[in-house]
Structures are given as structure tokens and as C-alpha cells.
Interface confidence: medium
Amino acid sequence: KSSNEATNITPKHNMKAFLDELKAENIKKFLYNFTQIPHLAGTEQNFQLAKQIQSQWKEFGLDSVELAHYDVLLSYPNKTHPNYISIINEDGNEIFNTSLFEPPPPGYENVSDIVPPFSAFSPQGMPEGDLVYVNYARTEDFFKLERDMKINCSGKIVIARYGKVFRGNKVKNAQLAGAKGVILYSDPADYFAPGVKSYPDGWNLPGGGVQRGNILNLNGAGDPLTPGYPANEYAYRRGIAEAVGLPSIPVHPIGYYDAQKLLEKMGGSAPPDSSWRGSLKVPYNVGPGFTGNFSTQKVKMHIHSTNEVTRIYNVIGTLRGAVEPDRYVILGGHRDSWVFGGIDPQSGAAVVHEIVRSFGTLKKEGWRPRRTILFASWDAEEFGLLGSTEWAEENSRLLQERGVAYINADSSIEGNYTLRVDCTPLMYSLVHNLTKELKSPDEGFEGKSLYESWTKKSPSPEFSGMPRISKLGSGNDFEVFFQRLGIASGRARYTKNWETNKFSGYPLYHSVYETYELVEKFYDPMFKYHLTVAQVRGGMVFELANSIVLPFDCRDYAVVLRKYADKIYSISMKHPQEMKTYSVSFDSLFSAVKNFTEIASKFSERLQDFDKSNPIVLRMMNDQLMFLERAFIDPLGLPDRPFYRHVIYAPSSHNKYAGESFPGIYDALFDIESKVDPSKAWGEVKRQIYVAAFTVQAAAETLSEVA
């Protein structure tokens, strides 16, 4: 029975009705409502917001809305013992201290419970020592320091600028280099766009602004005390010493006013090249230690934060499918924020709220989607994607059997230049077709499609006339669904012009200045970009839940598999002698990709021709499409990363935010020339090629004719 028979509305009309119901004014109103006080994970305020959302989703018309709670490890500063960094003289006297809080933005002076800047999950400690400036603290920055400049970070406190890579990777790299503490700071080169004023007069970061954030290296584990299993009341919890991903050295973030005071005294080596210089009026000397007159002075960290098992709450709303209620399309985004969450996450949560309202309106008029839609307001994303991961762990058996797709809905904007999409190749055609139907909100593209403005402003590097769509990495709530469970996933938001704005993220990210006013005054006064993002996210969910044949094109996977195989082969070919010596061949991988391409092509032909009125055959074909993403999952996971199980994509081992293709082979090849046992190292490369080839071939076979 078609999902549209009940109302006699054509599917196209349904989609139009859904999109027309989305209103910019509502998103604006919801954003205001969600951003008036902080909603830090684990706090009463965030619990109250969960209950409010539950109540409103019920009013909007969802079939059921439940709270799902977990007791997870969170981290908070000590209220009576603040964290700070000082410069001490030879007598141990503190001659400079970093600020204890950010100056509150206008209108927010009397707001209580603003958590001061801190690095979540930093251990306690008061290390003191000489400073070493390590640029962005990337893998390549430490290679430059240790291998080229012969600078030893062992026993030093390192200072690194935010940007380029996930902060947890910076801390991990510093730990591996032997550092005893890490200071993270926002350099104006990365967080102050030229020609724009600082908040409250513009969207740039003021000198007292600081980026909060967790510094975990969870690799998809979720709650550090219950990896692999939900943190329910009868969970077996590890002790802190055995917890997953916790940093072992104190870490603290500061703004660029305070960073100036630390960096201006730096001595030792000059920066190796201009890429190590930011925009402060300091020499960007690497150190170690301070120069000349200040050489007896040291830096001391004072970190007193505590890790606490705390209750968190997800809100899970259900709109039951009329035809295939056991097939789930999930729209999820987080609710918890570091402070007000003006952009992250509430610009996304407001969009989800409006999407729920629109779906609810259609449902009240008698319509139902073909498949079940689940809506989620995740908690504790900022503390390591904990809410989404715990829920997925609790429901993994249902999800792996019934999960069609997951659409992520964190920040709707990180700029107002053009669309940005990261998704599985299965969704490329869905995204292309949808954006061709939507109007562009961009100035100069009046009357043009979103596809057109997006393609013009962000062209694909490989295919002319098409927009760029990126690989999924991590750092957001799709991680468990895609990287662990193999559920087709995607995300969309409006972004900046990466060509002209080289700063990392948006300047006020995770600071107290991320307010409603930031969005309403500077980013999207008409909320037209928010509306466009709502149309893209909501439209994707609508199509995934309502189209008779799932809108997945397996041929697009074939295309990227070939591209990724070519790429990893060319990396390996930088070592032609070793490949010969150790008989390393990519033939099996290329053969598997070829087979996949041919089988995918034949499957697509069958998809055009089969009898869609036969529910059994329809379900069979849809199941082959649904389970294709699942077929790329290796139950054993990647080496040392058991919860990253997707063989084609994983978060980069050097930057959680970035996606890496054929990650098992990539990591086996990385820095292979420095491995002490080359025979063993190249053996691992061969093993990873075998795993990848087998997986691609096995996935191809899931698309073969069933009998």
C-alpha cells in the first residue's frame, strides 16, 4: 500500500507541502528560545530543555517522544579552584596570570552558570617548565620540530594554536612527544578575518575570547567508561585509569591577549618558515624557554577540573511509517552547548524543530511517511559524541537491521557563502536532485537553483558542472551511525568562502560570544540560509523516508572507489623499491573495484526495470540498497580502532574532523620509511590491501542478483 493512498496526494505534492510549511520566522523564534541561557551537558538547564523539546515535539504531532538517559563521564572545572596559567619568576612568584573567564557579551552580564573556558577531560596538575611553540601541533609540526630542528619537547609545556585539526589530536601528539602540559590558543591569523570587527561589533573573536572543547581521543568509543555498551544503570564501568581516550597531561585554552604575553618572551629557535607565524606581534620563536632577560622565568599551569559520572538525556521522537514501519530514517542533532550555543548547536536544533513541526503538520492532515522517521536531540555531543553513541550502542541490533539513513543536524551555518555537504556516495544523486529543485538564497542568484549557486561557488575538483561533496570524517553525531554501524549518512550546512577566509571554523566557535545576536545581526538576519539548510536536511529526510525506491545510487560508490584506489596506489608508489622487494600488489583491490563497478551497473539497470508493484521484490531491492553501506563494515574494525569499522572511510588518525579513504591501507603506509622493521610494516600494508579488496568484493556481491 503506497504511503500516499490515504490522502490521495502525489509524492511530489507531499514534498512541496512539507517544504512550503518550513518558515524562516519559526527557525528564528526557536533559535532565540534555545539560546537565552547556557545548556551545558549534565546540567539542570539542559535537562529542562530536553523536557521542553519533548513536550513541543508531542504537540507538533509525533507519535511518541521519549527521553533516553545515560550516566556518562563528563568533565567540569572546579567552581572554587579555577584553572589558569601563570608565568613565574625564579622565586616561584606568579608575575602574570591568564584570565579566569571571558568578559561576558552585552546583555549577558547577569547570566549565571557560564562555564569558564576549559579543556574538557584534562587531568588535574600543576606542571611548570619551559615553553615550546609547536604551531598547530599537527603530526607534521612535530616531525618538523623533532626531526628537522632537533627540538625535544620532553618535559616541556607546549603551546599550540587552534585550527587545522581536531584539538584532541594536538594533545595526543604533544603527549607522544613527551610534553608535560599543553596550552591551546586562538591566533588571530586563524580566528580573526581581515576587515571585520570583533564581537559585539562584528563576527570576529575578541582578544579575551576562548574556544572551549573536549580533548579526548575516543576513536568512536562513546562514554570512556563503557566502550561498546550503553552507560545504563547496570553498566560495568571501568575505573578512570582504564577509561578510553583520556589525556594524561594537563591542557588549558586561552585567548590571544593572554597568548601574546606568553609568546612575546619566547626565545630559542626562530620559526622554521612563514607557515609557523600567526598574526600576533610576536616573533613566533619555537623555544624552548624564554629569551635572554626572561630566561629564568617559567610557565606554570594550574588545572583542577574533575571528571564526574553524570546523567545525560537524549530526546527521541518517532513518526511511524505507514508502509515500512521497520525501516528507520533518522534526523539527529545535539542540544548541549558549551555556553549559549548561538551557532553550535542551536542553529541546527532550531532547524530540526521546524522540520519536526512541518512533518507534524502533514501528519495531522492525515499523511504518514512510507518509512518511520526518528528525530533525535542528542546530549553531550561536546563531551565526545556521548549521547548519540550511547543510544546507538543501546539500539545497535535494531539499527543495523532497520537503519536506512542518518542525517546529521548540528550547526546550520558556519558562514553564509554557499552550501557544504559531506555524505556517503550513495546520497550524491539525492543531494544533486534535491538542490536542483530548491531556490538559491544567495545574492546574485535570484531565481536560480541552489544547485547552480553551490556549483558555481564550490565546484567539484574532479567533475565539471558539479558541486564539491566531501567525505564524512567525524567530530559529530553521525560518527557512530556511519563509522561503526555502516548506516548511510549525510550532513549539510551553509559555509564560508574557504578561498578568501582561511581561518579555522568560524571565529567565535565554542566561545561565550556565540549568541543569538551573532546569528541575527551578522550571519543570517533574514534566516534565509537557515531556511535553505532546513529544506536540504528536511528534503533529504523526506525523500529517504517516502520514496518508493530508496534514493541511493550505487554507481556513485563505484566511481569513488576507483578514485580512492588510484589515490592510495599513488601513495604506495612513492616507495617503488620496497613494493618490489616485498611483492606489494594492488591488483586484488583494482580487480574488486572493477567487479563492483560492473555489478553496480547491472544492479542499476535492474532497478529501472523491476516490478515496483510487487512488494516482495521492491523490499528485496531496497534491502540491497540499504545494506550496501553495511557491507563495507569490517566486524573487527581498524587496527587499534575497533569502533571505526568502515573499510572505505574513517576519521583521519591525524585529524578526527577529516575523512580518510581506505584508512587501513593509508595508516599502514603512513611514515613507513621510519618504521624500525620494514618487513613487518610492508606486511601490514599487504594485509590491509587484502582486507580492502575482500571488503569491496564482498560488498559488490550483495548487489548481485539474489538468485
Epitope: 550516566d71 544503570e233 575505573g239 578512570i240
Partner: antibody, heavy 115, light 107 residues
Framework: VKLQESGPGLVAPSQSLSITCTVS????????VSWIRQPPGKGLEWLGV???????YYNSPLKSRLSINKDNSKSQVFLKMNSLQTDDSAMYYC??????????WGQGTSVTVSS | TVLTQSPAIMSASPGEKVTMTCRAS???????LHWYQQKSSASPKLWIY???NLASGVPARFSGSGSGTSYSLTISSLEAEDAATYYC?????????FGAGTKLELK
Amino acid sequence: VKLQESGPGLVAPSQSLSITCTVSGFSLTDYGVSWIRQPPGKGLEWLGVIWSDGNTYYNSPLKSRLSINKDNSKSQVFLKMNSLQTDDSAMYYCARHKVYTMDYWGQGTSVTVSS
Amino acid sequence: TVLTQSPAIMSASPGEKVTMTCRASSSVSSSYLHWYQQKSSASPKLWIYRTSNLASGVPARFSGSGSGTSYSLTISSLEAEDAATYYCQQYSGYPLTFGAGTKLELK
């Protein structure tokens, strides 16, 4: 947060014991409830727990005689223990269970097993 | 895991510093070792949780410390209202277990 136990006071040997714990200030769908007993002049013995999702755990020596149930809508938790002997005489407490601690306790109900 | 508290009974004068110990038969995570206070004919109260965190309303003269198999509760300056029995409790997998208690009396 309040927890209030109510029980029979006196139970004959070999008979069964039923105690009700009525809670307020929190929901049984959010928190588990543990049962603990304390014989006169002795220490505390943890009997078992019913978690928010209805799952239970019973302390091994009592497992065969003990059952814990609840009614979320009435905010009540029920402890039932069979085949009572004189050494089951004790003060019986219910307490809110929160990550391996009991953070709020009832005032207790005294149970004497005697013929 | 068996918890052994010592001493079983102790007496001290007001103003004195008092320390009682709780030893575990096998290692317990400091996150999962807690203390309760029970005054005569009253129900127990959570007093110190996760080794060193004072429960709401507990005076600052109380402190807790320890790791592995050895934990302690200390009162920096004893007051009359502190006379009570103190129980330690642990989790290292169910069931939860209590120590036999330390009875603290005033001299």
C-alpha cells in the same frame, strides 16, 4: 526527594514479607531503587536493585527468595521476600540508586520475624 | 570484594583529628568507593562519594582519600555532632558491598 517504606512489622517464620517503597521528587523511569537491610546492632547489607528500565539484580545469597517489582505510574517499588527466618529480622531501607551509590534513603521499616 | 573497616570502635575528643580506614580485599576504583554516616536510630546518609567528594550539606572538616585497596575518611577537627557510625561501600561489579562500619564516639 523522599522515599517512604511501609511494611507489616511482624512476620511469622516461613511466611513471606512484602514492603512498599513510595517515592516522590523523582521518577522511577529516571532512577533505580536499591533495598538494604540492617539487623539490630549490625551493619548494612545490600539486597538488590530495580533499575529505571525494570531490570533487577539480586544479591546472590538471597536471590532465590527475593523479588523486586515496581509501578512507575504510582511511584512505588515493591520488595517481596519468601520463607523468612528469625535472622531476617532487620530494619529494611529503600534508597535511590545513582551510579553505584544510594544518595537518598527512606526512614526504614522494622521487620521482626517471630511466632 | 570484602571491605574491612578499622577500627571497629573509636573514641576521640572534640577538636581532635580523626582518621578511619577502609581496606578492600581486591583493588577498587576510586570512582566507586563511597562513605555513609548513620546516627543511632536514623537511616544512613550518603556522606562522601567517589572517594573524596563531600555530599551536599556535609561540613568541610570531613575529607576522604585513597586508591587501590586502601581508603580513609578524615575529620580535621571533631565536633560533637560527628558521633555516628561510618560505613564505606564499594562497587567493583555487583553486588554492592558495605564495610562493617566504624563507630565514632565522643570522649
